[in-house]
Interface confidence: low
């Protein structure tokens, strides 16, 4: 999906008002210095690409983020403020329904959500680094 057509300010508002708090809730009890940020992004469309990938694509050791509150709100924000996004996600949603039976918080998931927090911060103020 090409995220260059999204309404970035509206997505930013959604992040600041709710998604950020849900991410903090998920990470509660974890030191902010516990994980190093290894995923980066250079501008807002690129950040959304990385955020979508980390939030909705199952990874080794963490296959359960899509049903978290922050993920559902992220999906809603992208669906509302990125034209045509919903249509591209129909097949992906079917796959997620099959893959995610229960919510399990693993250390790998905590690390992944820590990366998401960094990506969202960069989305709010892109650092314009070489991709």
């Amino acid at each position: 999906y090409d995220f260059t057509n999204c309404d970035f300010e509206k997505i930013k508002a959604a992040y600041l008002s709710t998604i950020s708090k849900d991410l903090i809730t998920y990470m509660s009890g974890t030191k902010s210095t516990e994980f190093n940020n290894t995923v980066s992004c250079s501008n807002r469309p690129h950040c959304l690409t990385e955020i979508q990938s980390l939030t909705f694509n199952p990874t080794a050791g963490c296959a359960s983020l899509a049903k978290e509150m922050f993920a559902m709100k992220t999906k809603a924000a992208l669906a509302i403020w990125c034209p045509g996004y919903s249509e591209t996600q129909i097949n992906a949603t079917q796959a997620m329904k099959k893959a995610r039976k229960s919510k399990v918080t693993t250390n790998k998931c905590l690390e992944q959500v820590s990366q998401l927090q960094g990506l969202w911060r960069r989305f709010n103020r892109p650092l314009l680094k070489q991709q």
Partner: antibody, heavy 117, light 107 residues
């Protein structure tokens, strides 16, 4: 209203230095990167480098690494570009421009720097 | 570094003409391209960003499109105030580079 107001024209001798200022207003200075672009007479646009006003992190293209210094004064929302060891080919209009995603939505009015013996 | 090759370098057109300017990137830059208009003695003005998004206040006769690594700026019906020089610029990470410019002159 967003504005980037640059300092006035400069005439310098070869080997001298010039410091161009760019005062920002109408937005939060530290939210946007400040880039510098120059344009030699009758020529195209050349990207020089950029500075993050929040922490002064700077990126310069190779050809300017030894001669350009980018700084900011957050208290006055002003960005500066200093070019040293001036030569005749540095004669150009120097622009500051703000950016969030890499494209420039606001530009300064330009500062003409003439290098002549 | 990513090279931006802009063509033509100049063109002559009449008021009401449809004008097309192209810019080719030396590698894939996705939709990370902006177009600017510059008039003599003035700063460049943003026209289009993300290849096809019109900047605020820009007339709808301007449009941008992308096909692979080739980008196009189209002016559907040239107006007197559109005679200027146009530049493309990629914004896909450092270093930013501009095309060589296209001067649109009155025929």
């Amino acid at each position: 209203e967003v504005q980037l107001v640059q300092s006035g024209a400069e005439v310098k001798k070869p080997g001298a230095s010039v410091k161009v200022s760019c005062k920002a207003s109408g937005y939060t200075f530290t939210t946007y990167w400040m880039h510098w672009v120059r344009q030699a007479p009758g020529q195209g646009l050349e990207w020089m480098g950029m500075i993050d006003p929040s922490d002064s992190e700077t990126t310069l293209i190779q050809k300017f690494k030894d001669r350009v210094t980018l700084t900011v004064d957050k208290s006055t929302s002003t960005a500066y570009m200093e070019l040293s060891s001036l030569r005749s080919e540095d004669t150009a209009v120097y622009y500051c421009a703000r950016t969030l995603d890499g494209y420039y939505d606001y530009w300064g009015q330009g500062t003409t720097v003439t290098v002549s013996s | 570094d990513i090279q931006m090759t802009q063509s033509p370098s100049s063109l002559s057109a009449s008021v009401g003409d449809r004008v097309t300017i192209t810019c080719r990137a030396s590698e894939n830059i996705y939709s990370y391209l902006a177009w600017y208009q510059q008039k003599p003695g003035k700063s460049p003005q943003l026209l289009v960003y993300f290849a096809k998004t019109l900047a605020e206040g820009v007339p709808s006769r301007f449009s941008g499109s992308v096909s692979g690594t080739q980008f196009t700026l189209t002016i559907s019906s040239l107006q007197p105030e559109d005679f200027a020089t146009y530049y493309c610029q990629h914004h896909y990470g450092t270093p930013w580079t501009f095309g060589g410019g296209t001067k649109v002159e009155i025929k």
